[in-house]
């Protein structure tokens, strides 16, 4: 019997599945090389990293930045740091210029006007 | 239009606010609400650590609440554990 997945579990499953969709393509099946990472960013983060996607060097710099153990590959542990940072940045954008009481969300990363 | 991955990231924000809005301090999840979050949103292998242990680990600025940044540490740890588990499952098959 499989339990019904919670909202958070579904979100995490999407992250894992996306990672695996690209990691299995070349070389080690559970790490992203530079080509796999670039493709993932170009296709699956086309809105969140819209500006960055215009410059390949910036994407290379992002990969280098995430590659904590400097092995030129991204493990899932390193990749999820990108997911968390983008989530934080999106949340910040939703609250940009917030003042006064109440809790309202404006569009997050990649939504509305850039 | 946002991709599935981008929607999932924004949906993580919604999960946090489901619990931060309980007490009305929109960017704070208190101990008892973290317990609810763990029970509702997290699998057994995350829950078994216990809400108090998680709270101590996540409240890095020791202000008695889990802010959004601190909640993301839970998401990272849960993600890493789920990823590991996904490989264990596939090895079983």
């Amino acid at each position: 019997m499989t339990c019904k997945m919670s909202q958070l579990e579904r979100n995490i499953e999407t992250i894992i599945n996306t990672f695996h969709q690209y990691s299995v393509k070349l070389g080690h099946p559970d790490t992203l090389n530079q080509g796999e990472f670039k493709e993932l960013v170009r296709k699956d983060l086309q809105n969140f990293l819209k500006k960055e996607n215009k410059n390949e060097k910036v994407i290379e710099h992002i990969m280098e930045d995430l590659d904590t153990n400097a092995d030129k590959q991204l493990s899932f542990e390193e990749f999820i740091m990108l997911m968390a940072r983008l989530t934080w940045a999106s949340h910040e954008k939703m609250h940009e210029g917030d003042e006064g009481p109440g809790h309202h969300h404006k569009p997050g990363l990649g939504e509305g006007t850039p | 239009m946002l991709t599935e991955l981008e929607k999932a990231l924004n949906s993580i924000i919604d999960v946090y606010h489901k619990y931060s809005l309980i007490k009305g301090n929109f960017h704070a999840v208190y101990r008892d609400d973290l317990k609810k979050l763990l029970e509702t949103e997290c699998p057994q292998y995350i829950r078994k650590k216990g809400a108090d242990v998680w709270f101590k680990e996540l409240d890095i600025n020791t202000d008695g609440a889990v802010n959004f940044q601190e909640f993301l540490i839970l998401v990272i740890k849960m993600g890493v554990a789920a990823h590991k588990k996904s490989h264990e499952e596939s090895h079983k098959e």
């Epitope: 969140f48 990293l49 710099h61 992002i62 930045d65 904590t68 153990n69 400097a70 740091m81 990108l82 968390a84 940072r85 983008l86 934080w88 940045a89 999106s90 910040e92 954008k93 990363l109 | 680990e57 890095i60 600025n61 940044q69 993301l72 540490i73 990272i76």
Partner: antibody, heavy 111, light 103 residues
Framework: PELVKSGASVKISCKAS????????INWVKQSNGKSLEWIGL????????FYNQKFKGKATLTVDQSSSTAYMQLNSLTSEDSAVYYC????????????WGQGTTLTVSS | ASLAVSLGQRATISCRAS??????????MNWFQLKPGQPPKLLIY???KQGSGVPARFSGSGSGTDFSLNIHSMEEDDTAMYFC?????????FGGGTKLEIK
């Protein structure tokens, strides 16, 4: 405070407690003449990966002992220029800021 | 650099990075306060987020290369050195510091 002879080496330790040691980077910072702050380098205790300020390459060596949750910085071939206060600082991995600092070790190099 | 501000007045300290410190939509710019005989104290992280236990009179703003630290009402206790620091990449770097004094 450490009083060391010129030309010698010193190993400064930084013991972490109250948190998961591998969840944060450890950075080392030099404070000279009570004023300026200089970043020496960082170590990721999870992987043991180190990054150094070019200026301190060959001067400083960063290591960690996971079993005792302790970070170390060895400084070699000491000169009077190395006399300073040395701090270790914990850095959050997500947003990368130094949220907790050690009390500092005062190093005096005597000729 | 040094700055003298009267008690109760606003103090603004600026910091310019040689290149953008933004990545992932986050500005990796932090501010520290340094007092004699004490370790540096985090005031602001990610350009505008307040550190733990930091008085509300301290705020940070900016993105890209230009940042500022504001103290909206100067108090005696705020006499100190203030440093900006980028954590976008290694080497992490600190600004030269600004000495804030009472006028």
């Amino acid at each position: 405070p450490e009083l060391v002879k010129s030309g010698a080496s010193v190993k400064i330790s930084c013991k972490a407690s109250g948190y998961s040691f591998t969840d944060y980077n450890i950075n080392w910072v030099k404070q000279s003449n009570g004023k300026s702050l200089e970043w020496i380098g960082l170590i990721n205790p999870n992987y043991g990966t180190t990054f150094y300020n070019q200026k301190f390459k060959g001067k400083a060596t960063l290591t960690v002992d996971q079993s005792s949750s302790t970070a170390y910085m060895q400084l070699n071939s000491l000169t009077s220029e190395d006399s300073a206060v040395y701090y270790c600082a914990r850095e959050t991995l997500l947003l990368r800021y130094f949220d907790y600092w050690g009390q500092g070790t005062t190093l005096t190099v005597s000729s | 650099a040094s700055l003298a501000v009267s008690l109760g007045q606003r103090a603004t300290i600026s910091c310019r990075a040689s290149e953008s410190v933004d990545i992932y939509g986050i500005s990796f710019m932090n501010w520290f306060q340094l007092k004699p005989g004490q370790p540096p104290k985090l005031l602001i992280y990610a350009a505008s987020k307040q550190g733990s236990g930091v008085p509300a009179r301290f705020s940070g703003s900016g993105s890209g290369t230009d940042f500022s630290l504001n103290i909206h009402s100067m108090e005696e206790d705020d006499t100190a050195m203030y440093f900006c620091q980028q954590s976008k990449e290694v080497p992490r770097t600190f600004g030269g510091g600004t000495k804030l004094e009472i006028k």
